[in-house]
């Protein structure tokens, strides 16, 4: 008996977009986060608001291949990278182009993943090795989350479970997705 035959459907979007009460963490990568710091401005400015719903943040599209060892997805996957800046929604998209980007007064808000989508991916392997199926969970939208003095950045990286959350302050800082994510249909196929 071997493994079941793999469907060779390359990538297939799974229609459900679930809401997850504890979304997986997102690596805060300096290359993409571009966080605007206070820049010596006074803590108050005219656009300050207490309502998180009035804030929004930048969603940058990021395309990558899913790989596992020598195997690579037939097609790249696209997801969002949540930029580190949060500002009043009415200023965000248009003002950027005019160079009037709002600078937050201190680290009050972070832009973090909000919703995820699952996508089935077929990984193709060299040398006649059987394909591997994966499900990756990809960031589908971002949100602003208000920080309190008790938060630090790693505490925003809500994982599916506390026990499984990669540890704060440790080296490789995975951008862990609590996902059925790149699921392994691992190397062999029997």
């Amino acid at each position: 008996q071997g493994w079941q035959a793999f469907k060779n459907d390359a990538t297939e979007i799974i229609p459900e977009l679930g809401e997850y009460p504890e979304p997986p963490p997102e690596l805060e990568n300096n290359k993409t986060m571009n966080r605007a710091e206070n820049g010596g401005r006074p803590p108050h400015h005219p656009f300050e608001t207490k309502d998180v719903s009035e804030y929004s943040c930048r969603e940058l599209h990021f395309t990558r291949y899913v790989t596992d060892g020598p195997c690579r997805s037939a097609k790249p996957v696209t997801e969002l990278v949540c930029s580190g800046q949060c500002g009043p929604a009415r200023l965000l998209p248009n003002a950027i182009g005019r160079g009037k980007w709002w600078r937050p007064s201190g680290p009050d808000f972070r832009c973090i993943p909000d919703r995820y989508r699952a996508q089935r991916v077929q990984l193709l392997c060299p040398g006649g090795e059987a394909p591997r199926a994966r499900k990756v969970r990809l960031v589908a939208s971002c949100k602003c989350k208000r920080l309190t003095r008790f938060h630090n950045q790693s505490e925003l990286k809500d994982f599916g479970t506390e026990a499984a959350r990669p540890q704060k302050g440790r080296k490789p800082r995975p951008r862990a997705r609590s996902a059925k994510a790149n699921q392994a249909e691992l190397e062999n196929a029997y």
């Epitope: 079941q4 459900e16 990558r64 499984a164 862990a176 059925k180 699921q183 392994a184």
Partner: antibody
């Protein structure tokens, strides 16, 4: 809280059939592969197999292929392990677990991040 | 299938002692495919180290993992009472997924 809740212990007769359940809370099982493991008394862990609740695709360790059947019911967010032809060898704790990944610096990792508390099956006449 | 051989099977360590548990793999695997779990009596295994060297949340920094190819290890820099448990390595390189037989670590 993200959890996998497993059904209670069972005492079963040799040759019988038993069906264990594993119900997920706070996440949709369709977004994760679910795996089952066996742990015999005072022994290590054996992987039984894996199911994709989204489409029912399964993989089994060949040594469990004829003994174990994995199914899911997405409407109740529950996975099932059915064991048939029970013998004393079947006496063990059975765990369900969720497969998750993380991606960092171009590398993907797959691992069991959430485990159920286990269901003890005792086969005895 | 890939066979994982853990050694020692049983060991005892005094508080403050350095502990190393090894996991030998029957064929070469990528380091991102080797994980460690901790299990205490009558409880389910807990994720402990992912991808050879990444500690799960809540795991004390006295734990570390290393290795590549066919040789991997888990190290406790300074043994504490709460570290007494059984540790399993597990590979995610190919199906069937396999675990080591476990190393039972006792407090001396």
């Amino acid at each position: 809280e993200v959890q996998l809740q497993q059904s209670g212990a069972e005492l079963v007769r040799p040759g019988a059939l038993v069906k264990l359940s594993c119900t997920a809370s706070d996440f949709n099982i369709k977004d994760f592969y679910l795996h089952w493991m066996r742990q015999r008394p005072e022994q290590g862990l054996d992987w039984i197999g894996r199911i994709d609740p989204e489409n029912g695709d399964t993989l089994y360790d060949p040594k469990f292929q004829d003994k174990a059947t994995l199914t899911t019911d997405t409407s109740s967010n529950t996975a099932y392990l059915q064991l048939s032809g029970l013998t004393s060898e079947t006496t063990a704790v059975y765990y369900c677990s969720r497969e998750a990944d993380y991606f960092h610096d171009g590398t993907s990792y797959w691992y069991f991040d959430v485990w159920g508390a286990g269901t003890t099956i005792t086969v005895s006449s | 299938e890939i066979v994982l051989t853990q050694s020692p099977a049983l060991m005892a360590a005094s508080p403050g002692e350095k502990v190393t548990i090894t996991c030998s793999v029957s064929s070469t695997i990528s380091s991102n495919h080797l994980h460690w779990f901790q299990q205490k009596s009558d409880t389910s295994p807990k994720p402990w180290i992912y991808g050879t060297s990444n500690l799960a949340s809540g795991v004390p920094v006295r734990f570390s993992g290393s290795g590549s190819g066919t040789s991997y290890s888990l190290t406790i820099s300074s043994m504490e009472a709460e570290d007494a448990a059984t540790y399993y390595c597990q590979q995610w390189s190919s199906y069937p997924l396999t675990f080591g037989a476990g190393t039972k670590l006792e407090l001396r």
